[in-house]
C-alpha cells in the first residue's frame, strides 16, 4: 500500500520508499550488524522507514542493502533519487581512518522478481555517492534533518525489471528516501494536436519523434510532430491542426461556435459574430442564416453581411426626340447594402386605345450603351416607331435581386413618340379601268408614323415621263381618276401625308385605259 505523494508530471515513480506503509523489508547482507531498518520522525513529525548503518569503528566494512524487484514499465532509462543523511566522521571520537563519508550505488537487471539473495558480483556499479552536507551529533537536537539529495540515472535497460543495491564501506549513514522513476513527456496538446504520454529515449541526448493526433473537431494542416527530450520536455513542435468550420480554439480544444457566431472554414481564426442581417440558432454554425428579406449571393463570402435587392430607381425623366427617347434617373434610395448595383431597361410597345395591351418592343429597338447591366443612370433608346405609345421600365438590380420574390424595384414611364413622315405605301391597285377613268385603292403605310391626314396620287402619261403630271388628293385610301384619254398608258404613284410631311411615293403602277366602253377590273401594278 502506498500513500499519494506529488511529483512532477513528467516523472513516473516506480519505487518510493517514503510512500510505503509499514516495513520496507529489503534484503541486507550481512543479515545483522550491517544495514538495519529504523523508523524515524521526518520534518513533519511523521514516522518514516529508513535504512541506516553506522559501523564506523571497524575497518573493511562491506554492508549491502538490496531493494525489492523494481519493474521497468517500458522505460529504457531510470533515475534514482536518494535522500540520505550522513554523520560527520569528525563527530565520532577516535574513529580515525575507519570512518567513511561515501557509499556505493549498484544495480542488477533481472527478469526474476523473487531473487532471495544478494550476489555482489551480479551488480553493476552506478556511482559512488558522497554527501554535500554532513552533521555532527549535536546538530540533531535542532530538529532540522540535513538531507542530501543525489540523483543518478542508469540505462539503457532491457530486462523486465531490476534491483538496486547500496554498499556501505564504513560510513554513518541513513537512507531516508529512495525513489526510482523514469521520465516521460506527459500527454499534452500543442497546436491542437494531442501527443500521448511518451517514455523518453535510452540516451540522455536522444529525442523520440512522436506524431500527434488532431483534437476533436479539428483537422491536420501540416502533420503535427514533436520530439520527446530526455528530460521529459516536449521540444520542437512541427505542423499543426486547425479547428474545423464551426469551431474555434478555446483552452487547447476546438469548441463549437456559440449561438450568434460562426466560422466558415478550417482556419486558426476564432468564430466571428454573425455579419449584419444574419443569425445562427445552433452552436457550431459554419455560416449564418440571412434575416427575412435579406439574401447572400452565390459568390458572397460568409463573412459578408446579408443584403437585399435595391429599391426602385428615383426621378425617372424621359426626353422624346422623334423616334428616339433619352431616359435618365437617380440611384435608388436603398441600395440593399451592396455595391454591385446595375440597371436593366424593359421596353414595351402599347396600344393607343388600351395601354394595358403591351408587347415587348422586340429586337429592332437599340439601346446605348446597352439594355441590361447598365452601370450609368441614363440610356438612349433609338429606332422606335413614330407616334407610338411606349412604356419603359428601369429596373435596379444587384447580386441578390434574383432571390427576391417581390419585384418592386422598378420605375416606369410611358411616352409617345413624335409623328414622322409615313413610310411608303406598299401596294397600289387598279380596281376598275374604263376608257376615261381608273379607280385606285391602296393599303395604309406599314408605318404611318402619325395620323394620315391625306393621300396624294400623282399620275402622268407614260410617254410624258413625269414631264407633265397631275395631282389628286384624298383622305380615303381609294380614288377615281377621271378625264383620262382612252387607250393611253398612265403611271400612278401614291404617297401619304402626316403632320410631319409626306412619305415616299409608292412604286409606280402602270395602267392603260380601254378603247371600248367596257370596265376592266385590275389589281396589279401594271394593269392593261
Amino acid at each position: 500500500v502506498t500513500g499519494s505523494r506529488v511529483y512532477p508530471a513528467n516523472e513516473v515513480t516506480l519505487l518510493d520508499s517514503r510512500s510505503v506503509q509499514g516495513e520496507l523489508g529489503w534484503i541486507a547482507s550481512p543479515l545483522e550488524g550491517g544495514w538495519e531498518e529504523v523508523s524515524i520522525m521526518d520534518e513533519k513529525n511523521t514516522p518514516i522507514r529508513t535504512y541506516q548503518v553506522c559501523n564506523v569503528m571497524e575497518p573493511s566494512q562491506n554492508n549491502w542493502l538490496r531493494t525489492d524487484w523494481i519493474t521497468r514499465e517500458g522505460a529504457q532509462r531510470v533515475y534514482i533519487e536518494i535522500k540520505f543523511t550522513l554523520r560527520d566522521c569528525n563527530s565520532l571520537p577516535g574513529v580515525m581512518g575507519t570512518c567513511k563519508e561515501t557509499f556505493n550505488l549498484y544495480y542488477y537487471e533481472s527478469d526474476n522478481d523473487k531473487e532471495r539473495f544478494i550476489r555482489e558480483n551480479q551488480f553493476v556499479k552506478i556511482d559512488t555517492i558522497a554527501a554535500d552536507e554532513s552533521f555532527t551529533q549535536v546538530d540533531i537536537g535542532d530538529r532540522i534533518m540535513k538531507l542530501n539529495t543525489e540523483i543518478r540515472d542508469v540505462g539503457p535497460l532491457s530486462k523486465k525489471g531490476f534491483y538496486l543495491a547500496f554498499q556501505d564501506v564504513g560510513a554513518c549513514i541513513a537512507l531516508v528516501s529512495v525513489r526510482v522513476f523514469y521520465k516521460k513527456c506527459p500527454l499534452t496538446v500543442r497546436n491542437l494536436a494531442q501527443f500521448p504520454d511518451t517514455i523518453t529515449g535510452a540516451d540522455t541526448s536522444s529525442l523520440v519523434e512522436v506524431r500527434g493526433s488532431c483534437v476533436n473537431n479539428s483537422e491536420e494542416k501540416d502533420v503535427p510532430k514533436m520530439y520527446c527530450g530526455a528530460d521529459g520536455e516536449w521540444l520542437v513542435p512541427i505542423g499543426n491542426c486547425l479547428c474545423n468550420a464551426g469551431h474555434e480554439e478555446r483552452s487547447g480544444e476546438c469548441q463549437a461556435c456559440k449561438i450568434g457566431y460562426y466560422k466558415a472554414l478550417s482556419t486558426d481564426a476564432t468564430c466571428a459574430k454573425c455579419p449584419p442581417h444574419s443569425y445562427s440558432v445552433w452552436e457550431g454554425a459554419t455560416s449564418c442564416t440571412c434575416d427575412r428579406g435579406f439574401f447572400r449571393a452565390d459568390n458572397d463570402a460568409a463573412s459578408m453581411p446579408c443584403t437585399r435587392p435595391p429599391s426602385a430607381p428615383l426621378n425617372l425623366i424621359s426626353n422624346v426626340n422623334e423616334t428616339s427617347v433619352n431616359l435618365e434617373w437617380s440611384s435608388p434610395q436603398n441600395t440593399g447594402g451592396r455595391q454591385d448595383i446595375s440597371y436593366n431597361v424593359v421596353c414595351k410597345k402599347c396600344g393607343a386605345g388600351d395601354p394595358s395591351k403591351c408587347r415587348p418592343c422586340g429586337s429592332g429597338v437599340h439601346y446605348t450603351p446597352q439594355q441590361n447591366g447598365l452601370k450609368t443612370t441614363k440610356v438612349s433608346i433609338t429606332d422606335l416607331l413614330a407616334h407610338t405609345n411606349y412604356t419603359f421600365e428601369i429596373w435596379a438590380v444587384n447580386g441578390v435581386s434574383k432571390y427576391n420574390p417581390n419585384p418592386d424595384q422598378s420605375v416606369s414611364v410611358t411616352v409617345t413618340t413624335n409623328q414622322a413622315a409615313p413610310s411608303s405605301i406598299a401596294l397600289v391597285q387598279a380596281k376598275e379601268v374604263t376608257r376615261y377613268s381608273v379607280a385606285l385603292a391602296w393599303l395604309e403605310p406599314d408605318r404611318p408614323n402619325g395620323v394620315i391626314l391625306e393621300y396624294e396620287v400623282k399620275y402622268y402619261e407614260k410617254d410624258q415621263n413625269e414631264r407633265s403630271y397631275r395631282i389628286v388628293r384624298t383622305a380615303a385610301r381609294n380614288t377615281d381618276i377621271k378625264g383620262l384619254n382612252p387607250l393611253t398608258s398612265y403611271v400612278f404613284h401614291v404617297r401619304a401625308r402626316t403632320a410631319a410631311g409626306y412619305g415616299d411615293f409608292s412604286e409606280p403602277l402602270e395602267v392603260t385605259t380601254n378603247t371600248v366602253p367596257s370596265r376592266i377590273i385590275g389589281d396589279g401594278a401594271n394593269s392593261t
Epitope: 550488524g33 529504523v38 523508523s39 524515524i40 520522525m41 513529525n45 514516522p47 529508513t50 541506516q52 553506522c54 559501523n55 564506523v56 569503528m57 571497524e58 543523511t85 550522513l86 554523520r87 565520532l92 571520537p93 577516535g94 574513529v95 580515525m96 575507519t98 551529533q137 549535536v138 540533531i140 537536537g141 535542532d142 530538529r143 554513518c172 549513514i173 541513513a174
Partner: antibody
Framework: QVQLLQSGAEVKKPGASVKVPCKAS????????MSWVRQAPGQGLEWMGW????????TYAQGFTGRFVFSLDTSVSTAYLQISSLKAEDTAVYYC??????????????WGQGTLVTVSS | EIVLTQSPATLSVSPGERATLSCRAS??????LPWYQQKPGQAPRLLIY???TRATGIPDRFSASGSGTDFTLTISRVEPEDFAVYYC????????FGQGTKVEIK
C-alpha cells in the same frame, strides 16, 4: 549471542580502589564503544561516560572525572571501570553497556548484568 | 545540561489497560530518543530507538512518539511482564536519563 559479562559484587572500604571488568563476547569488541552507567540503590540511571574501544579514548560525564578511569584490554575483549579513593556515596550497581552509534544518535543496546560495589567501613 | 523529567513517577494500571508515559526535556532534543525498561534486580534493556523502532524482541504493544521537548511511550495493553521502571534518554554531547516512571499493578 552478544553478551557483556561483569564480575560479582565487591565490598570495599572507603579510600580503597576497585576495578570492575566487563567482558564482551558475540561481536567484534573494537566495533562498538563501551559506556558505563551507575545506579545508586533505589535511584535512577546515571550515565558516567564512554570509551572508544578502537582507540582507547575515554569521554567522562560531568561529575565522573578524576577518580574514575575507563580502560581496555582488547586482547581479551574486556573493558574496565576503575574507581579510586572510594567513598560511601559510590555505593551503587555499575553497568557496562555497548554503545550503538547511529546516524540519528546513540543508545545502549546490550547491557551487562551489573556489578554491585559497596563501600562501607 | 539537558534535564529530562518523566511523569508520572508512578503509574498504576491493571493488566489489559493502556499506559501512557511522558518524558519532557528542558530544551529541544532529537525526536529519536531511546526508551529503556528495567525490571527489579535486572539490568536495563533497550526498548525503543529511532522514533518508534522497537529493539529486537520487543512486542508491538510498545510505541513511542513526540518531538521537540515532549515525548510519549505508550503500552497499548499492559501485560503482567510489563510492570517495570521505564527510562527515557537523550544523547546530546552529554547523555542524560529521565528519573524513571514506575508502572505498577493497580
Amino acid at each position: 549471542q552478544v553478551q557483556l559479562l561483569q564480575s560479582g559484587a565487591e565490598v570495599k572500604k572507603p579510600g580503597a580502589s576497585v576495578k570492575v571488568p566487563c567482558k564482551a563476547s558475540g561481536y567484534t569488541f573494537t566495533s562498538r564503544a563501551m559506556s558505563w552507567v551507575r545506579q545508586a540503590p533505589g535511584q535512577g540511571l546515571e550515565w558516567m561516560g564512554w570509551i572508544n574501544t578502537n582507540t582507547g579514548n575515554p569521554t567522562y560525564a560531568q561529575g565522573f572525572t578524576g577518580r574514575f578511569v575507563f580502560s581496555l584490554d582488547t586482547s581479551v575483549s574486556t573493558a574496565y571501570l576503575q574507581i579510586s579513593s572510594l567513598k560511601a556515596e559510590d555505593t551503587a550497581v555499575y553497568y557496562c553497556a555497548r554503545v550503538r552509534t547511529t546516524v540519528y544518535g546513540d543508545n545502549m543496546d546490550v547491557w551487562g548484568q551489573g556489578t554491585l560495589v559497596t563501600v562501607s567501613s | 545540561e539537558i534535564v529530562l523529567t518523566q511523569s508520572p513517577a508512578t503509574l498504576s494500571v491493571s493488566p489489559g489497560e493502556r499506559a501512557t508515559l511522558s518524558c519532557r526535556a528542558s530544551q529541544s532534543v532529537s525526536s529519536n530518543l531511546p526508551w529503556y525498561q528495567q525490571k527489579p534486580g535486572q539490568a536495563p534493556r533497550l526498548l525503543i530507538y529511532g522514533a518508534s523502532t522497537r529493539a529486537t524482541g520487543i512486542p508491538d504493544r510498545f510505541s513511542a512518539s513526540g518531538s521537540g521537548t515532549d515525548f510519549t511511550l505508550t503500552i497499548s495493553r499492559v501485560e503482567p511482564e510489563d510492570f517495570a521502571v521505564y527510562y527515557c534518554q537523550q544523547y546530546g554531547p552529554s547523555w542524560t536519563f529521565g528519573q524513571g516512571t514506575k508502572v505498577e499493578i493497580k
